[in-house]
């Protein structure tokens, strides 16, 4: 089996001239293409993979919403030579481009990483944007997280930062087959420089307060020790996606949008790929667009998510 091969990290890795063909290894009988698009109120970008896959032919489209960040995932697997170029990896263009000035800032200010490489989305390096409310939804929180797409034995990951509806979410996420959008939210100007180590704090559960030791007790060094023990005991892992349960009522819960999931013979990404041959695509300049007057994306193939702002 021969398949197209490319990796797109918000740049042009799967753009017209960058297509490769690879011969798949023995036992590989499907070509895969997967695209994940993320839309913030300040723009959108996509990650995509084409290559030799595993599983059975079929199609799976899914729309997801994480606190006002929209994610759209498409997977297509097929069993003919070079059949994996059916999905449109180009986001719908803007007309005119970037008219977010029409929106009234609501006072919140966040770092924005829309299609930026990890190198360009570090700390306070990325651009700062003014948040605004769109379609009756209030975007006053800031988000710091990642989008990850795994297909054809390749994992592509890009940082995501921007304005969201939630101000306290912690290691929250939405997933599709081989696709994850996850991260944390915060409140305050430019608070989303680095939320990787944020721990969950429910507004309904009072924080742990360290009382001063009795006056007859040992000096304050003990209190400092216990304080340091408490802080280091807090979990710092960023790999797992934790869904808050105790304070769910006070949060805007991440949910799948009302969108038909098309599953032709159950396409899935399980098992990875067994193909050889390198994949094209480099990091670098990012392709992204403002979503303030977008209608739908992607332009071709599968279900579409209506944009929230300005349509």
């Amino acid at each position: 089996l021969e398949c197209y091969s490319c990796v797109q990290k918000a740049d042009d890795g799967c753009s017209p001239h960058r297509m490769k063909t690879v011969k798949c290894g023995p036992g590989v009988d499907v070509c895969t293409e997967a695209v994940g698009a993320v839309e913030t109120i300040h723009g959108q970008f996509s990650v995509a993979v084409r290559g030799c896959g595993s599983g059975i032919p079929g199609k799976n489209d899914r729309g997801l919403d994480l606190h006002g960040l929209l994610a759209f995932f498409q997977l297509q697997q097929c069993s003919e030579d070079r059949c994996n170029a059916k999905l449109n990896l180009t986001l719908r263009g803007l007309n005119p481009a970037g008219n977010e000035s029409a929106y009234e800032p609501n006072g919140a200010e966040c770092y924005s990483c829309v299609g930026l490489s990890r190198e360009k989305c570090q700390g306070s390096m990325p651009p700062v944007v003014n948040c605004y409310n769109a379609s009756g939804r209030v975007y006053k929180g800031c988000f710091d997280g990642n989008v990850t797409l795994t297909a054809a034995n390749v994992t592509v990951s890009l940082p995501v930062r921007g304005c969201v509806q939630d101000e306290t979410c912690t290691r929250d996420g939405v997933t599709g087959p081989g696709f994850t959008l996850s991260g944390s939210c915060c409140q305050g100007p430019r608070c989303n420089a680095d939320l990787r180590n944020k721990t969950y704090f429910s507004p309904r559960i009072p924080p742990l307060v360290l009382l001063p030791p009795p006056t007859t007790a040992a000096p304050s060094t003990r209190a400092q020790n216990s304080s340091s023990t408490t802080s280091t005991a807090a979990p710092t892992t960023t790999t797992s996606i934790i869904k808050p349960t105790t304070a769910q009522a006070s949060h805007t819960s991440p949910h799948e949008m009302d969108l038909e999931v098309i599953q032709e013979e159950g396409a899935s990404l399980s098992g990875g790929a067994a193909g050889h041959g390198g994949t094209a695509g480099h990091g670098g300049a990012a392709g992204h667009q403002d979503r303030s007057n977008m209608e739908k994306y992607p332009g071709k193939g599968g279900a579409q998510i209506p944009a929230k702002g300005g349509s």
């Epitope: 091969s5 740049d11 042009d12 753009s15 017209p16 001239h17 960058r18 297509m19 490769k20 063909t21 690879v22 070079r82 180009t90 986001l91 719908r92 263009g93 803007l94 007309n95 481009a97 299609g115 041959g277 390198g278 094209a280 480099h282 670098g284 300049a285 990012a286 392709g287 992204h288 667009q289 332009g299």
Partner: antibody
Framework: EVQLLESGGGLVQPGGSLRLSCAAS????????MSWVRQAPGKGLEWVSY????????YYADSVKGRFTISRDNSKNTLYLQMNSLRAEDTAVYYC??????????WGQGTLVTVTS | QSVLTQPPSASGTPGQRVTISCTGS?????????VHWYQQLPGTAPKLLIY???KRPSGVPDRFSGSKSGTSASLAISGLRSEDEADYYC???????????FGGGTKLTVLG
């Protein structure tokens, strides 16, 4: 019908500047990757520059890097090439081309740029 | 000197089959990138003839065919006609130069 119409070519002295335009119609311009390709008199094709649909990914040939700037205005369906510090070897017919099906599937008729003293 | 190497000229008589070669390297054709062919009739802009190694855009006669193997590709024209007299260029992406590269072009002459 897809149409690409270049303009802005002409006679210019070495070290001078020119701005080429390419007006696109008959397709969704804001979805398309676009390129400039040039052809010196009696010579072969040479790719010059490449711009993504949104305008945020750009590549240049080494021969023009630092001197030429590609840009686009999706609201006007127009592609541009700003050419500064022009040299005699930049003399060529400049074509704008649309990328589709992994290739340049539509080309303009070209505009001639002549750099001479 | 062009990154992709083509013979400067080729010729044939009407009805004959002519093949034009295009040789690249491990950073372009050999890296797996697909090859395209363009036809440029005298005094006109180039036109896409073959894309993705061997596919024809609508309107291109099936007399034109493309193939690719290793670091080279070839364009075959069967049943040669006088209107096929033109310059033919191959093209592919190049990893090293980060852009599409063209062959130097092959001038096809239809004799007689």
């Amino acid at each position: 019908e897809v149409q690409l119409l270049e303009s802005g070519g002409g006679l210019v002295q070495p070290g001078g500047s020119l701005r080429l335009s390419c007006a696109a119609s008959g397709f969704t311009f804001s979805n398309a990757w676009m390129s400039w390709v040039r052809q010196a008199p009696g010579k072969g094709l040479e790719w010059v520059s490449y711009i993504s649909s949104s305008g945020s990914t750009i590549y240049y040939a080494d021969s023009v890097k630092g001197r030429f700037t590609i840009s686009r205005d999706n609201s006007k369906n127009t592609l541009y090439l700003q050419m500064n510090s022009l040299r005699a070897e930049d003399t060529a017919v400049y074509y704008c081309a649309r990328e589709g099906l992994w290739a340049f599937d539509y080309w303009g008729q070209g505009t001639l740029v002549t750099v001479t003293s | 000197q062009s990154v992709l190497t083509q013979p400067p000229s080729a010729s044939g008589t009407p009805g004959q089959r002519v093949t034009i070669s295009c040789t690249g390297s491990s950073s372009n054709i050999g890296a797996g990138y697909v090859v395209h062919w363009y036809q440029q009739l005298p005094g006109t802009a180039p036109k896409l003839l073959i894309y993705d190694n061997n596919k024809r855009p609508s309107g291109v006669p099936d007399r034109f065919s493309g193939s690719k193997s290793g670091t080279s590709a070839s364009l075959a024209i069967s049943g040669l006609r006088s209107e096929d007299e033109a310059d033919y260029y191959c093209a592919a992406w190049d990893d090293r130069l980060k852009g599409p590269v063209f062959g130097g072009g092959t001038k096809l002459t239809v004799l007689g």
